[in-house]
Structures are given as structure tokens and as C-alpha cells.
């Protein structure tokens, strides 16, 4: 699920997640990540794949939390 631009609020431009992927992304395909703006209606972690795709994920998902800890360390 790609991120979507939101023009609402003073933080334009930014990206917000409105839906999350259902599936765990293979770890080796992920290059980077960032958190969406705190003013978005839903929290989100966006993973950037090695092919340049942006994938919205749920910060509550355990795999997302595990991957972030792994990436912070590495």
C-alpha cells in the first residue's frame, strides 16, 4: 500500500498512511524506513524497499517493531 500525500494542516507537504499492508515484507528487501507525521490521522511506519517502493505499515505490528529495532542497531 503506497503512502498518500496529505495537504491538510500546516505541515504540507507530507505523507500519511490511510491503510496498512496485510503482509510482512521480507526483511532483505527493505532499505530504509521513516515514521509518518504525528499530525496524520493514523500512525504509520513507511518502509522503503530496495526497488524504491514505499509501503505503509502498522506500528503496532510485531514484525514492524522487530524490523525497526534491527535497522536502528545496524
Amino acid at each position: 500500500t503506497k503512502t498518500e500525500s496529505s495537504s491538510r494542516g500546516p505541515y504540507h507537504p507530507s505523507e500519511c498512511c490511510f491503510t496498512y499492508t496485510t503482509y510482512k515484507i521480507p526483511r532483505q528487501r527493505i532499505m530504509d524506513y521513516y515514521e509518518t507525521n504525528s499530525q496524520c490521522s493514523k500512525p504509520g511506519i513507511v518502509f522503503i524497499t530496495k526497488r524504491g517502493h514505499s509501503v505503509c505499515t502498522n506500528p503496532s505490528d510485531k514484525w514492524v517493531q522487530d524490523y525497526i529495532k534491527d535497522m536502528k542497531e545496524n
Epitope: K24, P26, W63, Y67, K69, D70, N74
Partner: antibody, heavy 122, light 110 residues
């Protein structure tokens, strides 16, 4: 060639403590892997016990019935252990370790060990 | 927790026949389903993942289908070597991390 091997299975008395070890050959655990312990009582189906993330956090997850009595740990980049306490006859089973290698969006166990037998009897 | 209900518990078919095994999840599992074959004294062997993707080296006589809560494993042109117990499995790493196996189906080849 990648493989998993379980060890530590034994005949023990009720109330005993036992540690099982799962050793990986041909690969080391990474942020792609989740390692699982699954057991199978004689003539019965498969039942999961615990799971550990192969990456830095080493996060652990347990079946609700296993919390407090079973402990999964990553003791090196190629070994995972399962500590079992207060064993009862109901814990008699073959214990398997398995890997979810995380190579696709669809999770599955792509590698299993041959299993180690734990028998609890007085 | 998600419960996987597998039917039938046992099935007997002749060589060359077809076997169909069903697995029903207690909620939508979004095709996060795998099928395994287990023979006595051996660990389970992966057959299918993602509900329909054949694992490497598995004959095309095996096929999987389904979505939502209903999934099926079909074995065509049954061979003696297919005599085994088959399990479905759901895995999630979402708000909970868990896996749930079906109760198993024993396939007897006559």
C-alpha cells in the same frame, strides 16, 4: 546445504527441568528469520510453543499456554534454546525447531529439524 | 486466536484418484496459509505457501486454492508415496505473533 538439528531430548521425571537446543548449519540467524519451536505428542497434531526473532532485538513470543513455563533464547548466531520447567506427562512429545526464513510476503516454515523426543514419566 | 478447522480427519482413495482436503479459518487470514506433508518419523515437509504457491521440488499434482476463511489442498493422480498426514498452517506477525495448525488429515492410498 542448510539444516536444523535439535538436541537435549531425554526421559525425565515429572517436575523436572530440561533445555533443548536447536543448531543451525549452513546459515546463521538474521533479521530475515523467525525461529520457532513446535511439538507433537505421540499420535497427535502439531502445536506451537514459542518463537524468537533472529535479528538484533531477539524478541520472543509464546503460545498462551506456554508462558511462564517455557523460555526461548538465542544463545548464538546459530543456536536457539528452549528451557522447559515443571514438566508433566502432558509434555511428552517430539520437539521440532523450524525456521520462517521470511523470503516471501507469505510466511511459512521452509526448514525443519528432525525433532528430539522428550518423555516425562515417573 | 485464530482456529484452523481441517476436514476430513481421514480419507482413503485408490492410486490414481483425487483427494481434497479443506481448511477453514475462524476469521479472514488473507491467504497466509501453508500446507505440509508429514510421514511417520519425519518432520513436516512444506508443500504450498501463500495458499497456492507450490514449494520448490513439489510435484504439480499438488495444488492449493482459497481465500478469506476457506482453503483447499488437492492431490491429483494419487501415488502410494502420498500416503501421509497433511496439515494446514496460518502464521501472523501482526498485533500478536502466533501460528495455528489444522488438526491434520490422514491420507490412505489403497
Amino acid at each position: 546445504c542448510q539444516s536444523l538439528e535439535e538436541s537435549g531430548g531425554d526421559l525425565v521425571k515429572p517436575g523436572a527441568f530440561l533445555t533443548l537446543t536447536c543448531t543451525a548449519s549452513g546459515f546463521s540467524f538474521s533479521g530475515s528469520d523467525y525461529m520457532w519451536w513446535v511439538r507433537q505428542a505421540p499420535g497427535k497434531g502439531l502445536e506451537w510453543i514459542a518463537c524468537i526473532y533472529g535479528g538484533y532485538s531477539g524478541s520472543t513470543y509464546y503460545a498462551s499456554w506456554a508462558k511462564g513455563r517455557f523460555t526461548i533464547s538465542k544463545t548464538s548466531s546459530t543456536t536457539v534454546t528452549l528451557q522447559m520447567t515443571r514438566l508433566t506427562a502432558a509434555d511428552t512429545a517430539i520437539y521440532f525447531c523450524a525456521r520462517d526464513g521470511g523470503v516471501t510476503h507469505f510466511s511459512h516454515f521452509d526448514l525443519w529439524g528432525q525433532g528430539t523426543l522428550v518423555t516425562v514419566s515417573s | 486466536d485464530v482456529v484452523m478447522t481441517q476436514t476430513p480427519a481421514s480419507v482413503s482413495e485408490p492410486v490414481g484418484g483425487t483427494v481434497t482436503i479443506k481448511c477453514q479459518a475462524s476469521e479472514d487470514i488473507y491467504r497466509l496459509l501453508a500446507w505440509y506433508q508429514q510421514k511417520p518419523g519425519q518432520p513436516p515437509k512444506l508443500l504450498i505457501y501463500g495458499a497456492s504457491t507450490l514449494a520448490s521440488g513439489v510435484p504439480s499434482r499438488f495444488s492449493g486454492s482459497g481465500s478469506g476463511t476457506e482453503y483447499t489442498l488437492t492431490i491429483n493422480d494419487l501415488e502410494c508415496a502420498d500416503a501421509a498426514t497433511y496439515y494446514c498452517q496460518y502464521i501472523t506477525y501482526g498485533s500478536d505473533v502466533l501460528t495455528a495448525f489444522g488438526g491434520g488429515t490422514e491420507v490412505v492410498v489403497k
